[in-house]
């Protein structure tokens, strides 16, 4: 299953499959997730080691048993790959690292006014993988405001150095934020020239293209079909690059197919997995296990559940079958691709779905009335769980926020439905940033069921929580995916990085905002909160957040939206925007429904009709 816990001051011994430099443990974990054989990782921050060569070291590890012995190492951080973790699987990494210079091949230098502008330039440059920016206070005046665009053979820095007044980060192309745009077309009977960066075997051009998309240096590819004249080159997928970023030449060639990486696509990237099953095809590789199962789909599920399994072959040969079950060969290789592909067989083959980010049809948990005042504009994909609850009567308007917690579930505030309990009048918009982008053609979700907490009473602040079941499940993308819920009764975690988002009023007597707003707000203890609201009962099922001096808060139109906190690199839904005295007033924090206190209720209500909890636990 999915394991998200990080181990502080611990280092996994042995099992090394690769090493690289990464700026933090989260980026190291992401590289582990996308490495075909990595199950575990250990990261050494600069503070944890004196050896300059090992600072920022990220060590990717494999283990036949799925675990390795941990040794104590002060400052080290270790953890698991996020394979099998559904919607948490993403190559997108937005963080900017202050005081750090990520080294690589500097291929472009320009003057820009901010680190965000530098990151944007990197994202819009086809070859840029990461960047460094010298701030206005950099010690050498001639380098100030320099934006250095960089790449390296492996897509990660060749070294990372601590350097004051330098900020570094990665391209946001994996976040589907590139302005370059992409070529979706595949060209038959055409071979591209230029430099081969890798060679893998794939059953079709589509798998070749997806592998190219997620390879750090692949810009385009040529695939040799299974009827290519040279037998030893059949099914070869050549991943390619060039200085210019485009093929310098192409040659008409029967039974070849060429195309481009889709990394520069805007708004949609292909999933980093291959779900199609190939009938009459055998995939060769290192044998992991053989099991008898009923049907090729069960074979694929078995492979997906066995974390080391990369691909499989389901044999229909009479000698491989008994009764209704046949042999399911679970296999792996060094690069995650078959070492041999045979056609015209009595088998069916396919890949593990461990890197699919759709996950299951569930809500996400972990085991361990009211624009935002004083906020700033959000960017695409920053809060992909945020939804807009709109009512269509004579006109259509935004009324509340909400949080996507599963393919078919939204969590919001009960008071949003005061006087509007009719599900037909509601439209739920997900994966949006600007309300003005909504037109009559914009897809929306309709409500199948509104589940208001049984103890909620209109015009009371208690139990202000409601679940919405959507009529049809939503697909997950970089711009539309769920937020994880906290553990039941989560009281031990100290959250220090919390944000509230919404399209609500920017001042008490304001109006709904166009661009989704965000504001960083500290949590306030319930005791402190109670002092500020002596006429109300602040219960343990509420959580408060706000600045003593005011100025930043949720407001009308943010109700039902998320209060999210980042802990150990993972966002969790801590609160639901509920109520407050005015907006952003001094010593009047916002009051939020405490989600951890309602976990039993959420799980009970989101149970599937067959009685299984619709849960996906990343821990």
């Amino acid at each position: 299953g999915c394991l998200t816990q990080l181990y502080e001051n611990a280092f996994f011994r042995g099992g090394d499959v690769a090493s690289m430099y990464t700026p933090n443990a989260q980026y190291c974990q992401m590289r582990c997730t996308f490495h075909p054989r990595c199950l575990l990782f250990s990261f050494l921050p600069a503070s944890s080691i004196n050896d300059m060569e090992k600072r920022f070291g990220c060590f990717l590890k494999d283990s036949v048993t799925g675990t390795l012995p941990k040794v104590h190492r002060t400052g080290a951080v270790s953890g698991h790959s996020l394979k099998q973790c559904g919607h948490q699987i993403s190559a997108c990494h937005r963080d900017i690292y202050k005081g750090v210079d990520m080294r690589g091949v500097n291929f472009n230098v320009s003057k820009v006014s901010s680190v965000e502008e530098c990151q944007k330039r990197c994202t819009s440059n086809i070859r840029c993988q990461f960047f460094s920016y010298a701030t206005q206070t950099f010690h050498k005046a001639e380098y100030r405001n320099n934006c250095l665009l960089k790449y390296s053979p492996g897509g990660t820095p060749t070294a990372i150095k601590v350097l004051s007044n330098v900020e570094s980060g990665f391209s946001l192309k994996p976040c589907a934020l590139s302005e370059i745009g992409c070529h979706m077309n595949i060209f038959q009977h055409l071979a591209f020239s230029d430099v081969d960066v890798a060679r893998v075997l794939t059953p079709d051009a589509f798998v070749c293209r997806t592998i190219c998309t997620y390879h750090p240096n692949c810009l385009f590819f040529t695939f040799y079909t299974n009827v290519w004249k040279i037998e030893s080159q059949r099914n070869v997928c050549l991943l390619k690059t060039s200085e210019s970023g485009t093929p310098s030449s192409s040659t008409p060639q029967e039974n070849t197919i060429s195309g481009y990486s889709l990394l520069t696509c805007k708004r949609t990237l292909p999933e980093p997995c291959h779900s199609k099953i190939y009938p009459g095809v055998d995939f060769g590789g290192e044998e992991l296990n053989v099991t008898f199962v009923k049907g090729v789909n069960v074979c694929q599920e078995t492979c997906t559940k066995m974390i080391r399994c990369q691909f499989f072959t389901y044999s229909l040969l009479p000698e491989d079958c008994k009764e209704e079950k046949c042999k399911c060969f679970l296999r792996l290789s060094m690069d995650g691709s078959p070492t041999r592909i045979a056609y015209g067989t009595q088998g069916s083959s396919g890949y593990s779905l461990r890197l699919c980010n759709t996950g299951d049809n569930s809500v996400c948990t972990t085991k361990t009335s009211t624009r935002i005042v004083g906020g700033t504009n959000s960017s695409w994909g920053e809060w992909p769980w945020q939804v807009s609850l709109q009512v269509k009567l004579t006109a259509q308007r935004h009324l509340c926020g909400g949080s996507l917690i599963g393919h078919q579930w939204v969590l919001t505030a009960a008071h949003c439905f005061d006087g509007l309990p009719l599900q037909d009048v509601w439209r739920i918009y997900s994966g949006i940033l600007n309300l003005s982008d909504i037109t009559k053609d914009t897809p929306f979700s309709q409500i199948k069921e509104i589940i208001i907490h049984q103890n909620y009473k209109v015009s009371e602040g208690n139990h202000d929580i409601a679940l919405i079941k959507l009529q049809a499940p939503l697909n997950y993308t970089e711009f539309q995916k769920p937020i994880c819920l906290p553990s039941k009764g989560d009281t031990s975690t100290i959250y220090t990085n919390c944000w509230v988002t919404g399209w609500g009023f920017s001042k008490e007597k304001g109006e709904i905002q166009n661009i989704l707003q965000k504001v960083n707000i500290p949590l306030v203890t319930n005791e402190e909160c109670q002092k500020r609201y002596q006429d109300y009962k602040i219960t343990q099922r509420m959580v408060c957040a706000g600045y003593k001096e005011g100025g930043k808060d949720a407001c009308k139109g943010d109700s039902g939206g998320p209060l999210v906190c980042k802990h150990n690199g993972m966002w969790r839904l801590v609160g639901i925007t509920s109520w407050g005295e005015g907006c952003a007033r001094r010593e009047q924090p916002g009051v939020y429904t405490k989600v951890a206190e309602y976990m039993d209720w959420i799980l009970e209500k989101t149970q599937s009709s067959d009685g299984k909890a619709q849960m996906q636990s990343p821990a």
């Epitope: 079709d204 051009a205 589509f206 079909t225 292909p270 056609y343 015209g344």
Partner: antibody
């Protein structure tokens, strides 16, 4: 030039049998997966059956499962469809197609042969 | 089996018009979607594979787009010879089902 020529169609009574053939030329037949697709008069296309290059794997639409058998003879560059227990609803033009697995599409089609099931 | 829903079932348009045909599936099929053109009295012909890739020899006025569950075929400027029935087909899972077809008539 790729050519696919279907034959064997005709009039048959309900419950009867018919064997369709598809003679292929202009490409290496033994390396291609093949399929049969049919079209009832005035209706849309319906996927019927599929066979991999060696003949080792076959697949059928639910509507013909247990009654139709797809096969091939790579030495004769010929694809077959054995149709038993024919019903009136099997009346259609039957097309033979090459299946290009690397792009997952039927890239070449024959002209079709008409099968009429009627008493 | 994966069900394909094609719309509209028929469309009548003038030469030079822009035409859009939609194909939807219940489950995601990535971009394993093809479009075929069948002119009266002829067998079908592959127009577009992989949702957006033009088969060689097909005029560039034809284009395809979409991924997942919703796909479109667009004819940017309708020509008299485009009179035909257009079919979408998923090639994600056997049996490789077709849409019910869209009949395109020229006004």
């Amino acid at each position: 030039e790729v050519q696919l020529l279907e034959s064997g169609g005709g009039l048959v009574q309900p419950g009867g049998s018919l064997r369709l053939s598809c003679a292929a030329s202009g490409f290496t037949f033994s390396e291609y997966d093949m399929a049969w697709v049919r079209q009832a008069p005035g209706k849309g296309l319906e996927w019927v059956s599929y066979i991999v290059s060696s003949g080792g794997f076959t697949s059928y639409a639910d509507s013909v499962k247990g009654r139709f058998t797809i096969s091939r003879d790579n030495s004769k560059n010929t694809l077959y469809l054995q149709m038993n227990s024919l019903r009136a609803e099997d009346t259609a033009v039957y097309y033979c197609t090459t299946w290009a697995g690397w792009i997952a599409a039927a890239d070449y089609w024959g002209q079709g042969t008409l099968v009429t099931v009627s008493s | 089996d994966i069900q394909m829903t094609q719309s509209p079932s028929s469309v009548s348009a003038s030469v030079g018009d822009r035409i859009t045909i939609t194909c939807r599936t219940r489950q995601s099929i990535s971009n394993y979607l093809n479009w075929y053109q069948q002119k009266p009295g002829e067998p079908p012909k592959l127009l577009i594979f992989a949702a957006s890739s033009l088969q060689s020899g097909v005029p560039s006025r034809f284009s395809g787009s979409g991924t997942g569950t919703e796909f479109t075929l667009t004819i940017s400027s309708l020509q008299p010879e485009d009179l035909a029935i257009y079919y979408c087909q998923q090639s994600y899972d056997i049996p490789f089902t077709f849409g019910q077809g869209t009949k395109l008539e020229i006004k």
